[in-house]
Interface confidence: medium
């Protein structure tokens, strides 16, 4: 057993060396080790094949060190590894895309607080067993296409506290089992209408504290299991383009955050969900650092990520709401409620923890994938109940005289709910 470490065999063969001031991975780690705890040291480099002899290793904690470099082959031979915690290594900044290749049994990967600026192509390739991926509190600016494509068993993806400015079409492709997606505290101004296409099992979506002024209803349509959505702390523009989002929220019966309006000024601070339909009139004209939203440009969107308010044909001018004009029976807002049956109610009153699935199931060390969280996953906190079906939001065809509220690349539909503890 290395000098700074404590080694023991029960309940698992363990080499434990936390907070010992180690500057390198110690030599002489017993080959039979199933758990290695090296957190809280001063290790700056993980050389290739550092743990190659430890074929039975299932848990490796390297968090809270000063890692600046991890060789691409650092974890070679660790075919049984289930938990890898590299979090809180702010100098790391980048990880070679081959670093995690071969870790076919990995179910929990912590890369939070690592100063990561980008996710290299293929970084998570082959991690078919991964269920929990922690990427929060980094410096990520973009979500490259197909980054998570192989993660078909991923249930929790933490991306909050980064610098992500948009959610492109293929960002979350392949995440068919995802239950929880945390994107709050980023700089998201635009969500592609098809960004959430594969997320049919998503129950929790956090988008609060971003730069969203609108959200395409089409993006929310695939979220059939959605229960919790937080949209607060965004610069929502509550004009005619917010109608689909408003309508969706009226139907949604889960638990949702407030959606406070930023514009127009007369509605600033008010919750979109609590507005009346005729409050959402015309097109707000932004002032100050924002660009005017009502323009004749040919693009589908304004710089804020809002759909453009369309200029009608001359004959249809009377059917378009201009700022300040009251809604009338013949205006372009008529019929804007997305079709679809109302979702079933979830009952009134608070849900009680001890009656919930996670509140009663034991946290077994080797549970079935579908039942209980595996060892190394995040705690249930206040657990969620079983999935409730949500209606898909389809869109009606719209004539040229209508604002293209629900079309691809435009509009502002939203959904949902959130519960946070």
């Amino acid at each position: 057993c290395p000098g700074a470490c404590v080694c023991y065999n029960e309940p698992k063969v363990t080499t434990s060396c936390p907070q010992q001031g180690l500057q390198a991975v110690p030599v002489g780690i017993p080959a039979a080790s199933q758990r290695i705890f090296l957190h809280g040291n001063r290790i700056s480099h993980v050389p290739a094949a550092s743990f190659r002899a430890c074929r039975n290793l299932t848990i490796l904690w390297l968090h809270s060190n000063v890692l600046a470099r991890i060789d691409a082959a650092a974890f070679t031979g660790l075919a049984l590894l289930e938990q890898l915690d590299l979090s809180d290594n702010a100098q790391l900044r980048s990880v070679d895309p081959a670093t995690f290749h071969g870790l076919g049994r990995l179910h929990t990967l912590h890369l939070d607080r690592c100063g990561l600026q980008e996710l290299g192509p293929g970084l998570f390739r082959g991690l078919a067993a991964l269920q929990y991926l922690y990427l929060q509190d980094n410096a990520l600016q973009a979500l490259p296409d197909d980054t998570f494509r192989d993660l078909g068993n991923l249930t929790h993806l933490f991306l909050h506290g980064n610098r992500i400015s948009s959610v492109p079409e293929r960002a979350f492709r392949g995440l068919h089992s995802l239950d929880r997606l945390l994107l709050h505290q980023n700089r998201v101004a635009h969500v592609h209408p098809h960004a959430f296409r594969d997320l049919g099992r998503l129950m929790t979506l956090y988008l609060f504290a971003n730069n969203l002024s609108a959200l395409p209803t089409e993006a929310l349509a695939p979220l059939r299991a959605l229960q919790y959505l937080r949209l607060n702390d965004n610069p929502w523009v509550c004009d005619c383009r917010a109608r689909p989002l408003w309508a969706w929220l009226q139907k949604f019966r889960g638990s949702s955050s407030e959606v406070p309006c930023s514009l127009p000024q007369r509605l600033a601070g008010r919750d979109l969900k609590r507005l009346a339909a005729n409050d959402l009139q015309g097109c707000a004209v932004a002032t100050g650092p924002y660009h005017p939203i009502w323009t004749g440009r040919a693009t589908d969107e304004e710089p804020l990520g809002l759909p453009k308010c369309c200029q009608p044909d001359a004959a249809d001018k009377a059917s378009v709401l201009e700022p300040g004009r009251p809604a009338s029976a013949g205006n372009a807002l008529k019929g804007r409620v997305p079709p679809g049956d109302s979702p079933p109610g979830n009952g009134s009153g608070p849900r009680h923890i001890n009656d919930s699935p996670f509140g009663t199931l034991p946290g077994s060390a080797e549970p079935p994938l579908t039942a209980v969280r595996p060892e190394g996953s995040e705690p249930p906190g206040f657990p969620t109940s079983g999935p409730r079906r949500r209606p898909g939001c389809s869109r009606k065809n719209r004539t040229r005289s209508h604002c293209r509220l629900g079309q691809a690349g435009s509009g502002g539909g939203g959904t949902g709910d959130s519960e946070g503890s």
Epitope: P18, F37, H39, G40, W61, H63, S87, D112, Y134, Q136, D137, F158, H160, G161, L182, H184, S255, S257, P350, R351, H352, I353, N354, S356, F358, G359, T360, L361, P362, G363, S364, A365, R373, P374, E375, G376, S377, E378, P379, P380, G381, F382, P383, S418, E419, G420, S421
Partner: antibody
Framework: QMQLVQSGGGLEQPGRSLRLSCVTS????????MHWVRQAPGKGLEWVSG????????GYADSVKGRFTVSRDNSKNSLYLQMNSLRAEDTAVYYC?????????????????WGQGTLVTVSS | DIQMTQSPSSVSASVGDRVTITCRAS??????LSWYQQKPGKAPKLLIY???NLQSGVPLRFSGSGSGTDFTLTINSLQPEDSATYYC?????????FGQGTKVEIK
């Protein structure tokens, strides 16, 4: 700085009621679950109850279920514990605590801030 | 409910000694265990969260490890101000439960 200020404790007879309050400041109360933990004289800590940020989930220890009710008012940054049908064994110092958990951090942090505690004595 | 069993119930050690407190859960709780320090008449103070993560401001002589059912809190070089009662708490399943406490005294 962060503060959790408790009130409402005191002496009460068995079978009667008391309401504890915990007023917070220095953080965004809306974003956190909150808990009540108690400690009987000379004994250890016992988790009593917890409530999620939006009151959508609520939990109780078996020993208080059906008698105690936890609630919160986010507009007042306040947490409450309504204690009915008090028993002698409810005598304890009651603490409110903030739960800095994964719903906002993505990573569990335990009960990172606590109130000063308020003594509840149940005696005839 | 998940039972948490701490051992020893009390320990007396000298300044500079290494003190180890163990906590065993009655069923697997993954990493979801916190450690608290409480001094007489004061509210508990969070030391370690998620089994091994040191809470901000806590001295480096405190460390935690373990996963599943067996957990350890280690005080590497005991200081006079470490005289207190230490509690583990599982946060894996509701209701959350605490261990019965370990009283650490300075010889």
């Amino acid at each position: 700085q962060m503060q959790l200020v408790q009130s409402g404790g005191g002496l009460e007879q068995p079978g009667r009621s008391l309401r504890l309050s915990c007023v917070t400041s220095g953080f965004n109360f809306n974003d956190y679950a909150m808990h009540w933990v108690r400690q009987a004289p000379g004994k250890g800590l016992e988790w009593v109850s917890g409530i999620s940020w939006n009151s959508g989930a609520i939990g109780y220890a078996d020993s208080v279920k059906g008698r105690f009710t936890v609630s919160r008012d986010n507009s007042k940054n306040s947490l409450y514990l309504q204690m009915n049908s008090l028993r002698a064994e409810d005598t304890a110092v009651y603490y409110c605590a903030r739960d800095y958990n994964y719903e906002t951090s993505g990573y569990y942090h335990g009960f990172d801030n606590w109130g000063q505690g308020t003594l509840v004595t149940v005696s005839s | 409910d998940i039972q948490m069993t701490q051992s020893p119930s009390s320990v007396s050690a000298s300044v500079g000694d290494r003190v180890t407190i163990t906590c065993r859960a009655s069923q697997g709780i993954s990493r979801w265990l916190s450690w608290y320090q409480q001094k007489p008449g004061k509210a508990p103070k969070l030391l370690i969260y998620a089994a091994s993560n040191l809470q901000s401001g806590v001295p480096l002589r405190f460390s935690g490890s373990g996963s599943g059912t067996d957990f350890t809190l280690t005080i590497n070089s005991l200081q006079p101000e470490d005289s207190a009662t230490y509690y583990c708490q599982q946060t894996n399943n509701f209701p959350y439960t605490f261990g019965q406490g370990t009283k650490v005294e300075i010889k």
